[in-house]
Amino acid sequence: PEPPTACREKQYLINSQCCSLCQPGQKLVSDCTEFTETECLPCGESEFLDTWNRETHCHQHKYCDPNLGLRVQQKGTSETDTICTCEEGWHCTSEACESCVLHRSCSPGFGVKQIATGVSDTICEPCPVGFFSNVSSAFEKCHPWTSCETKDLVVQQAGTNKTDVVCGPQDRLRA
């Protein structure tokens, strides 16, 4: 556009001046004037600002509270917040990962479709015909029923989604 119809992208308007914003990692100490430039200062230890800004205070880094099952996944810098994740066996309750819950186990009759991560819970699926799960587990998939035929055995008891088939010897004809 010619002439400009606003301050430039990294500027803000104050007292008829287009002043430079402070860059990420710095906070505003004083606005620019006709005589002076914008004054910015780096954020302190354990503080950050992640955008071009005119904030007078930096944000505190997130605290990963071990009492809530949290641990640091990525340490914060002056330009980025700390990223928390959950301890082994736990996952975040929200995208912000402010607390953790124990991974869900898949009940008998269900197998693990997707193993849980630090940010997502276990995904279970019902065992289809031909498969079973007889344990409550956060890791076990549905197992296929045993193939009696390949062992030269016959099915003595049919399998279910919770139990394997029971194989037994074939009936022999008596002479």
């Epitope: 430039r8 287009c18 914003l21």
Partner: antibody, heavy 125, light 107 residues
Framework: QVQLVQSGAEVKKPGASVKVSCKAS????????MYWVRQAPGQGLEWMGW????????TYAQKFQGRVTMTRDTSISTAYMELSRLRSDDTAVYYC??????????????????WGQGTLVTVSS | DIQLTQSPSFLSASVGDRVTITCRAS??????LAWYQQKPGKAPKLLIY???TLQSGVPSRFSGSGSGTEFTLTISSLQPEDFATYYC?????????FGQGTKVEIK
């Protein structure tokens, strides 16, 4: 205090290229557009174009399209102007200048509040 | 391109004189005009922007006026350090052109 310090004088042959640098200090480099202006010996001022130091996007005067390239390196707060296929009439002092914008009566008024000291580029065979 | 014509091109004056320089634009540019002072071997220095606003640190003897196509730079009482070349610049339409300059010399 704001300072724009340019690279030293250059002597080039016709057809060659020249790259002039402009190092900024005393302000947030990416916050202000940088312009290039040249002045032939004993002549007036000629506007060449500008660069947005944040995005790196340049805008060139039509006269220089295809011959001029404006770039920047934000890590060292430096803007560059490269002019190719030099001719004798490109002999001039090349200046970088920072844009200031004033808001008044509902309008945004630009001007050039700080200038580099100038770089003399002589094109001669 | 918008043409800016300054008059006069040369001006001889004495210390204490009131000096007026005119800048005419080939088409209306509202108040998108700046004035610069340049001394030999030096970079231009911003004096006035938005046609009439004095740049910080510039002595109040300098003033600017005008709008549309006709603008003036006035030095109310010329001082020894004011002998220089003065340029107007339009910032209304690309390319942002300059006037040809007015050289103020000592009489």
């Amino acid at each position: 205090q704001v300072q724009l310090v340019q690279s030293g004088a250059e002597v080039k042959k016709p057809g060659a290229s020249v790259k002039v640098s402009c190092k900024a200090s005393g302000y947030t480099f990416a916050g202000y557009y940088m312009y290039w202006v040249r002045q032939a010996p004993g002549q007036g001022l000629e506007w060449m174009g500008w660069i947005n130091p944040d995005s790196g996007a340049p805008t060139y005067a039509q006269k220089f399209q295809g011959r001029v390239t404006m770039t920047r390196d934000t890590s060292i707060s430096t803007a560059y102007m490269e002019l190719s296929r030099l001719r004798s009439d490109d002999t001039a002092v090349y200046y970088c200048a920072r844009e200031k914008i004033y808001y008044g009566s509902g309008n945004y008024y630009p001007s050039f509040d700080y200038w580099g000291q100038g770089t003399l580029v002589t094109v001669s065979s | 391109d918008i043409q800016l014509t300054q008059s006069p091109s040369f001006l001889s004056a004495s210390v204490g004189d009131r000096v007026t320089i005119t800048c005419r634009a080939s088409q209306g540019i509202s108040s998108y005009l700046a004035w610069y002072q340049q001394k030999p071997g030096k970079a231009p220095k911003l004096l006035i922007y938005a046609a009439s606003t004095l740049q910080s640190g510039v002595p109040s003897r300098f003033s600017g006026s005008g709008s549309g196509t006709e603008f003036t730079l006035t030095i109310s009482s010329l001082q020894p350090e004011d002998f220089a070349t003065y340029y107007c610049q339009q910032l209304w339409s690309y390319p942002w052109t300059f006037g040809q300059g007015t050289k103020v010399e000592i009489k």
